[in-house]
Interface confidence: medium
Amino acid sequence: EPHSLRYNLTVLSWDGSVQSGFLTEVHLDGQPFLRCDRQKCRAKPQGQWAEDVLGNKTWDRETRDLTGNGKDLRMTLAHIKDQKEGLHSLQEIRVCEIHEDNSTRSSQHFYYDGELFLSQNLETKEWTMPQSSRAQTLAMNVRNFLKEDAMKTKTHYHAMHADCLQELRRYLKSGVVLRRTVPPMVNVTRSEASEGNITVTCRASGFYPWNITLSWRQDGVSLSHDTQQWGDVLPDGNGTYQTWVATRICQGEEQRFTCYMEHSGNHSTHPVPSGKVLVLQSHW
């Protein structure tokens, strides 16, 4: 997987009036990294991991950049014509990637009320837009504004591409997010489900990257999908991920079941703990 930096900016309008606040979230390698709150933009590292990446410094630079981006997006929203009454949102997502062969990719995407209407490849400067007439109208509107906005358009978008990559490289230099593998902690628990049945849950946490296989096996063979329930693979705030899988089994049959985990080429098997039911709750 490539290293990536992703900016997600959102601005709002109410009855055609652009609101002063905005929200910016930054993800580094898919992990929540920085956040700029709506009213007062102050870059906030998302957890100890982000602080380690950023080092012992203030985040004035990030705050300045994110505030500037927020202002730009508010101006863009103000230029969208025919805004209807009520609440509307304009979202800009900017992504840059550095691949293992050192090649780079950068793109920018605009969403109005959650619907994608305009994308740009920041390397080729190529714009693309969906086929719907609403999206195309919005896209032309925004593109014209961005072009009018300056003679600086070329340098502006080149700078967006270069700045994103420069920031990504700077963060990667911290060493904290260099290509790494963090194995999961796996924990198996059991809980009462209904008379004669128990729910067994296998949790994996603290792993990186996010790709993981977690499944229940009976007598050494994976159960079919319809007998298992999976949780989403979610960031845990520490630069790593967590997930779970559960299944319902007959009490007394625990010894036949194991949780199978595979991550980054390593795998392990984890039995159901014997003894009393530990947690009195049901996932199903």
Partner: antibody, heavy 118, light 108 residues
Framework: EVQLVQSGAEVKKPGASVKVSCKAS????????IYWVRQAPGQGLEWIGY????????IYNQQFKDRVTITADTSTSTAYLELSSLRSEDTAVYYC???????????WGQGTLVTVSS | EIVLTQSPATLSLSPGERATLSCSAS???????LHWYQQKPGQSPRLLIY???NLASGVPARFSGSGSGTDYTLTISSLEPEDFAVYYC?????????FGQGTKVEIK
């Protein structure tokens, strides 16, 4: 191609022990359990137990628990069945099998005939 | 322990005829855990049908399985010469894993 190759026939005296091997190939040995089943002459199939080679967990049929030991060597992808204090009624063909979906037996070894006779 | 009782013990039929083999469990089992095997003289058993009605790899379509709860059936729609063998049902739902005593399908 999945293959389970068992050791050759054995003739033992009552009270002795026998150890049958089952070498697996064609799949990742630790990813499936190995079952052991026996079949006395002219009789049906009887499940003895199984081993999960990855964690070394062994489940025995209580009927055999006192006299049977199941082991596995992951370095050679081989499972073993040892039966002690042999009696004439232990005369049977002993099969190893790989666990399949929902606790069935999807591949079988060719069988090892163990004859207990004084 | 779940006891599986197969009937009949022996079925004498001619090639081309339909064979119906029954397997009755002493207590209800999930249909996901009922399987059938074929064994010919001097050979190892071979998985025929898994999860009540799914044909194992390489098994001809003339074999089919059905059932639920405590009663399960293996059907061979039109017997071929190579189908004359002993058939076993097996349950994997609870320990110990158990087999039926077998039904021998012989040439009449």
């Amino acid at each position: 191609e999945v293959q389970l190759v068992q050791s050759g026939a054995e003739v033992k005296k009552p009270g002795a022990s026998v150890k049958v091997s089952c070498k697996a190939s064609g799949y990742a040995f630790t990813s499936n359990n190995i079952y052991w089943v026996r079949q006395a002459p002219g009789q049906g199939l009887e499940w003895i137990g199984y081993i999960d080679p990855y964690i070394g967990r062994i489940i025995y049929n209580q009927q055999f628990k006192d006299r049977v030991t199941i082991t596995a060597d992951t370095s050679t992808s081989t499972a073993y069945l040892e039966l002690s204090s042999l009696r004439s009624e232990d005369t049977a063909v002993y099969y190893c099998s790989r666990s399949g979906e929902r606790s069935n037996f999807d591949y079988w070894g060719q069988g090892t005939l163990v004859t207990v006779s004084s | 322990e779940i006891v599986l009782t197969q009937s009949p013990a022996t079925l004498s039929l001619s090639p081309g005829e339909r064979a119906t083999l029954s397997c009755s469990a002493s207590s209800s089992i999930s249909s996901n855990y009922l399987h059938w095997y074929q064994q010919k003289p001097g050979q190892s058993p071979r998985l025929l049908i898994y999860r009540t009605s799914n044909l194992a790899s390489g098994v001809p379509a003339r074999f089919s399985g059905s059932g639920s709860g405590t009663d399960y059936t293996l059907t061979i729609s039109s017997l071929e010469p190579e189908d004359f063998a002993v058939y076993y049902c097996q349950q994997g739902g609870s320990l110990p894993l158990t087999f039926g005593q077998g039904t021998k399908v012989e040439i009449k």
